[in-house]
């Protein structure tokens, strides 16, 4: 009922709580003297389902049979309509449509830790749409029983608040959950278990790691566990890895030796526990311990390359370059590189420690046979030295690789190809492909890159430190014992027409011809490898097509003679530059009038 209804009643048969699909009879009846004042047959009773009129009847009462009500609550309101007045509410009633509870499924109980309390979970099944009460019952040895009720609508968990103890670990306990609502009740299948079945140990804590004598090969993991733990699972991985290494141990008593850790690596360690070989469940994983393993002396050898530069008749500059060891080879923080330079015949040697750089430059005499050895050192020791005899890398013309080409291969890659040297190709022990940004003036500070290629390869894809729209000087060396031959080419990964033309800075007259000098185009405006320069000229104030002279690009060249100008004629001159993608815009214009005699 809505409330104490003064004007009449609404009754529902068989019940105001019905099973989905059932039929109900609703009766609305007026109390005495509550109808329309003048003539009771004018009483019009109207039944509403919420706000929708579903039936009406003239008289003191109305009967309605209702079917097909949805799950949930439906409100019926009875109203009285009299002539010349608004409808007035008489009374109302709710009908609750639901289902009996399904049998609770998958009842399982757990006690978290030896000191924890027993808690059970289950699956309720489909919604009943009615208030459903759950009662959990636990019976144990000696007729002991515990019971707990749940008042929550969506109840699927209850904690008994009792602690099972290990005094009799094989004693049986039985749990059962019963669901009850206005339409029926249902009980789960009983779940029978022992202490060992349901106690889930707390995760291990206080995890520590010790490295004896600061060595990665003598590593012990320590932890603390609850008293009854029999089994442990350990998992560990490098911090940057997704894959775990897993170890199962029995009766570990809170310690285990790990034998396969890599040096100078941060690891993550976790441990889980179990009380019995085949009963019960594993604990949650412990909190992670993160620890770095100690360093070991480096393994592997440095990849070393060098460059020679003539200074004068008696001296040469040697620039050494080397690549960092990989993390797995360095096995620690590289503190310095040791470079030893030795004159082989005289036995003189000098050693230098280099920190913070992977290159070293020195000046040595042009005479004598020189060798270098480079090694990397961490706190535990040094790598094996890489030894190189300093030779003239391009001296052996017959060892020069042939038909070297450089082609763009996708974004920021250049494919370098070559043919073996004419001299017996089987003599080649390895090829080295070297590349550096092309800088007019041959700046020795430009970083050098190289890669080594097996003697049977005739191509290499270079991608390290390759930028779009930059021209690279690429050399391919063929090495054989203490001899070397080389060939070079220019290449770029991506190109377009240069952004500007060369700037003519001077025009001078020499014996009836002129010499044009220009400034190089800034590297960032070249937009790739330059192929040609063009010099254009035409008579001032003439509309004729300009004449032009095309000069193949050479790095060091920045002047060129022209001898086809007429004396005492004023010419306008300008220059452009070309890449494989096209021609630049004009550089600056200069006027010049040749003073010499006519030819």
């Amino acid at each position: 009922k809505i409330d104490a209804c003064k004007r009449g009643d609404v009754t529902v048969k068989p019940s105001h709580v019905i099973l989905l699909g059932s039929t109900v009879n609703i009766t609305c009846s007026l109390k005495p003297r509550q109808g329309c004042f003048h003539y009771s047959r004018r009483n019009k009773l109207i039944l509403y389902k919420f706000d929708r009129r579903i039936n009406f009847h003239h008289g003191h009462s109305l009967n309605s049979q209702v079917t097909g009500l949805p799950l949930g609550t439906t409100l019926f309101v009875c109203k009285l309509a009299c002539i010349n007045s608004d409808e007035i509410q008489i009374c109302g009633a709710e009908i609750f449509v639901g289902v009996a509870p399904e049998q609770p499924q998958n009842l399982s109980c757990i006690q978290k830790g030896e000191q924890g309390t027993v808690a059970c979970t289950w699956e309720r099944g489909r919604d009943t749409h009615l208030y459903t009460e759950y009662t959990l019952q636990l019976s144990g040895p000696k007729n002991l029983t515990w019971q707990k009720q749940c008042k929550d609508i969506y109840c699927d968990y209850l904690d008994f608040g009792i602690n099972l103890t290990p005094e009799s670990p094989e004693s049986n306990f039985t749990a059962k959950v019963t669901a009850v609502n206005s339409l029926g009740s249902s009980s789960s299948l009983p779940s029978t278990f022992t202490f060992l079945d349901i106690v889930r140990p707390l995760p291990p804590w206080d995890i520590r790691i010790k490295f004896q004598k600061a060595s990665v090969s003598r590593c012990t993991l320590y932890w603390r566990d609850e008293g009854l733990v029999l089994l442990n699972r350990l998992r560990y991985r490098p911090s940057n890895s997704r894959l775990w290494n897993m170890v199962n141990v029995t009766k570990a008593k809170g310690r285990h030796d790990l034998l396969d850790l890599k040096p100078f690596t941060e690891y993550e360690f976790q441990i889980s526990s179990k009380l019995h070989l085949y009963k019960g469940s594993w604990s949650d994983w412990s909190e992670s311990l993160r620890a770095q393993t100690p360093e070991e002396e480096p393994t592997g050898m440095l990849d070393v390359w060098y460059m020679k530069r003539h200074i004068d008749y008696s001296r040469q500059q040697i620039s050494l370059f080397w690549k960092n060891l990989s993390v797995s080879e360095a096995r620690g923080k590289i503190l310095h590189y040791q470079v030893t330079l030795q004159e082989l015949t005289g036995g003189k040697a000098m050693t230098q420690n280099i920190t913070g750089h992977t290159s070293w430059t020195t000046v040595i005499p042009r005479t004598g046979n020189w060798a270098v050895a480079v090694s990397a050192a961490n706190s535990k020791g040094s790598s094996l030295p890489t030894r190189i005899n300093i030779m003239n890398l391009c001296e052996a013309g017959l060892l020069a690789p042939r038909q070297v080409s450089a082609n763009s291969e996708g974004m920021d890659n250049i494919l370098v190809t070559w043919q073996p040297p004419r001299k017996d190709p089987s003599a080649v022990q390895e090829y080295v492909v070297e590349w550096r940004e092309l800088h007019p003036g041959g700046d020795t500070q430009v970083p050098l890159n190289w890669l080594r290629s097996r003697p049977y390869n005739v191509s290499a894809l270079i991608s390290e430190n390759i930028k779009s729209y930059i021209c690279y000087e690429i050399r391919v060396y063929a090495l054989s014992g203490d001899q070397g031959g080389c060939s070079s080419i220019l290449g770029n990964s991506k190109h377009k027409a240069p952004l500007s033309g060369p700037h003519i800075n001077a025009i001078t007259e020499e014996k009836g011809s002129i010499l044009i000098s220009w400034n190089s185009i800034p590297v960032q405006e070249q937009m790739g490898c330059l192929l040609h320069y063009r010099i254009y000229w035409k008579e001032r104030d003439s509309n004729s097509q300009p004449q032009l002279c095309e000069i193949p690009y050479r790095v060091s060249q920045n002047s060129h003679p022209i001898n086809s100008l007429q004396p005492r004629v004023t010419y306008v001159l300008w220059m452009t530059a070309l890449t494989a993608a096209g021609e630049s815009s004009h550089g600056n214009e200069r006027e010049f009038c040749l003073q010499g005699k006519a030819n």
Epitope: F96, Y131, Y154
Partner: nanobody
Framework: QVQLQESGGGLVQPGGSLRLSCTAS????????MDWYRQAPGNQREWVAS???????YYDDSAKGRFTISRDNAKMTVYLQMNSLKPEDTAVYYC?????????WGQGTQVTVSS
Amino acid sequence: QVQLQESGGGLVQPGGSLRLSCTASGSIFSIYNMDWYRQAPGNQREWVASITPSGDPYYDDSAKGRFTISRDNAKMTVYLQMNSLKPEDTAVYYCKVPTEKGNYWGQGTQVTVSS
């Protein structure tokens, strides 16, 4: 045990607006309808509006077009937005949760529409 607390009533001029709130405690809120009723002096309590758990609203003819019922299940609160109020809307407004075990009513909040 479910408890309901209404708020938001007051004195308002004809044509004005008010927003009533009703907050429930207890978990049954989420499976039952929530209703607003009103009781004018000397009259019996009358149904005004209902909203189902999924948010479907229903209104008595007297409220249609002027009142809006809504609910926030997370906050366990039902609202009644009343616009274009008339003097005949003067009453104590109650919220109610009907359950098969019985009805839960709030204490009511007074709404007076007068110039």
